[in-house]
């Protein structure tokens, strides 16, 4: 019963990291414009994001243009994409599997199966989840990097996005959902070791506990 | 007193190389980007490129990509330009100047400026 | 790249004029902006940053003022030693660009 809480709970938390993960991916919140100094009245601020830049006027009017040439664009950028694309399809592979192999669910009769199965969906979540996890960190990095950069001038310093701080978050749900399910997972049955196939029995360790002298310091 | 002390006047042959330094004393070699700045007779004045003497990293203006290579000496707190393939267009006065603090590519210090003059 | 436009190239002044330098940035600089002065013969020095602070040592007679696209630097009172080109410079992004300069020239 317990098993099924931990099941439930963990698909919930990888359902609200995919669904985190795809607005983090989706909005041009990746990198903002970073205005440093004072006395500075913004007439503009700049969002960017991996499929879309939009200029935020001071009236409160957006103008959003959609990257033009894929070869054009820089190789982290691209790389960034695939890294997001692949990390939501990987947790909907995840999530599938981990219904298909859910004590709710009856799929799957055999409990073994079930339980690997869904071990299976924690791996594929956890997974996800450090894809997710790779992009956030590297532009966080190169953001941050570029920020203390003194040869990066000041218009092309940027401020961490909105969509930054959603990625670290679904990452966290999908590889705590991914987590979950692989703890769900109960641990292989200990068989007792079949002694050698010899015509007597061995005698059991002396001591009503089972217990000998020997293992006791 | 903050100084940057730039090499003397140079006449080259057109086709040549020169390599021009700027000794900075006063501060801390490596708190401040070196800019290079060219101003040609009468004219304006250019932003070549400039350098971070923590690590060598480099930026240039397209213009001056290719003809410009800029290199620090950490041990003698030196910065160098070296000018290739010289024609007449490249006869000016070179400054270095030092990135302000806060606003990097703006410049509080300059050097004296090095002439060079091409001529066959 | 950011041109900066110095409307006038030469001014003919005389002492003890009030004198306007404007500079025009073909994009919004928010403020990165600096003013030089050169003299024949030496290199420029740094008379103002950030579009409106005077650098140590720079008499109070010079003013920076000015947003987004347009510049001024203003003498109050000019002296001899004032009469030299004066360049605005844009450090808002690379490459940092300079106007073509405006010479004060005594009448």
């Known amino acids: 019963m317990a098993s099924t809480g931990l099941e439930l709970l963990g698909m919930t938390l990888a359902v609200l990291g995919w669904l985190g993960t795809l607005v983090s991916c989706a909005l041009p919140l990746w990198k903002v414009t970073a205005f440093i100094g004072n006395s500075i009245v913004v007439a503009q601020v700049v969002w960017e994001g991996l499929w879309m830049s939009c200029v935020v006027q001071s009236t409160g009017q957006m103008q959003c243009k959609v990257y033009d040439s894929l070869l054009a664009l820089p190789q982290d950028l691209q790389a960034a994409r695939a890294l997001c694309v692949i990390a939501l399809l990987l947790a909907l592979l995840g999530l599938l599997v981990a219904i298909t192999g859910a004590q709710c669910t009856t799929c799957v009769e055999d409990e073994g199966a079930k339980a690997r199965i869904v071990l299976t969906a924690g791996v594929i979540l956890l997974l996800a989840g450090i894809l997710v996890l790779i992009p956030v960190c590297w532009t966080a990095h190169a953001i941050i990097q570029d920020f203390y950069n003194p040869l990066v001038a000041e218009a092309l310093k940027r401020e961490l996005g909105a969509s930054l701080y959603l990625g670290w978050a679904a990452a966290a749900l999908l590889m705590l959902g991914g987590g979950l399910l692989c703890c769900t997972c109960p641990p292989p049955q200990v068989e007792r070791p079949r002694g050698p196939r010899l015509g007597y029995s061995i005698p059991s360790r002396s001591g009503a506990s089972g217990l000998d002298k020997r293992d006791y310091v | 007193e903050v100084q940057l002390q730039q090499s003397g006047p140079e006449l080259v042959k057109p086709g040549a190389s020169v390599k021009i330094s700027c000794k900075t004393s006063g501060y801390t070699f490596t708190e401040n980007i070196r800019h290079w700045v060219k101003q040609s007779r009468g004219k304006s004045l250019e932003w070549i490129g400039t350098?971070?003497?923590?690590?060598?990293?480099?930026r240039y203006n397209q213009k001056f990509k290719g003809k410009a290579t800029l290199t620090v000496d950490k041990s003698s707190s030196t910065a160098y330009m070296e000018l290739r393939s010289l024609t007449s267009e490249d006869s000016a006065v070179y400054y270095c100047?030092?990135?302000?603090?806060?606003?990097?590519?703006?410049?509080?210090?300059w050097g004296q400026g090095t002439s060079i003059t091409v001529s066959s | 790249d950011i041109q900066m436009t110095q409307s006038s190239s030469s001014f003919s002044v005389s002492l003890g004029d009030r004198v306007t330098i404007t500079c025009k940035a073909s994009?919004?600089?928010?403020?990165?902006l600096a003013w030089y002065q050169q003299k024949p013969g030496n290199a420029p020095r740094l008379l103002i940053s950030g579009a409106t602070s005077l650098e140590a040592g720079v008499p109070s007679g010079f003013s920076g003022s000015g947003s987004g696209k347009d510049y001024t630097l203003s003498i109050t009172s000019l002296q001899t030693e004032d009469v030299a080109t004066y360049y605005c410079?844009?450090?808002?992004?690379?490459?940092?660009?300079f106007g073509g300069g405006t010479k004060l020239e005594l009448k």
């Open positions: 994009e919004d600089i928010y403020n990165r």
């Open positions: 350098i971070n003497p923590n690590n060598g990293e480099t």
């Open positions: 410079q844009q450090y808002w992004s690379t490459p940092p660009t």
């Open positions: 100047t030092r990135g302000i603090t806060k606003s990097p590519y703006g410049m509080d210090y």
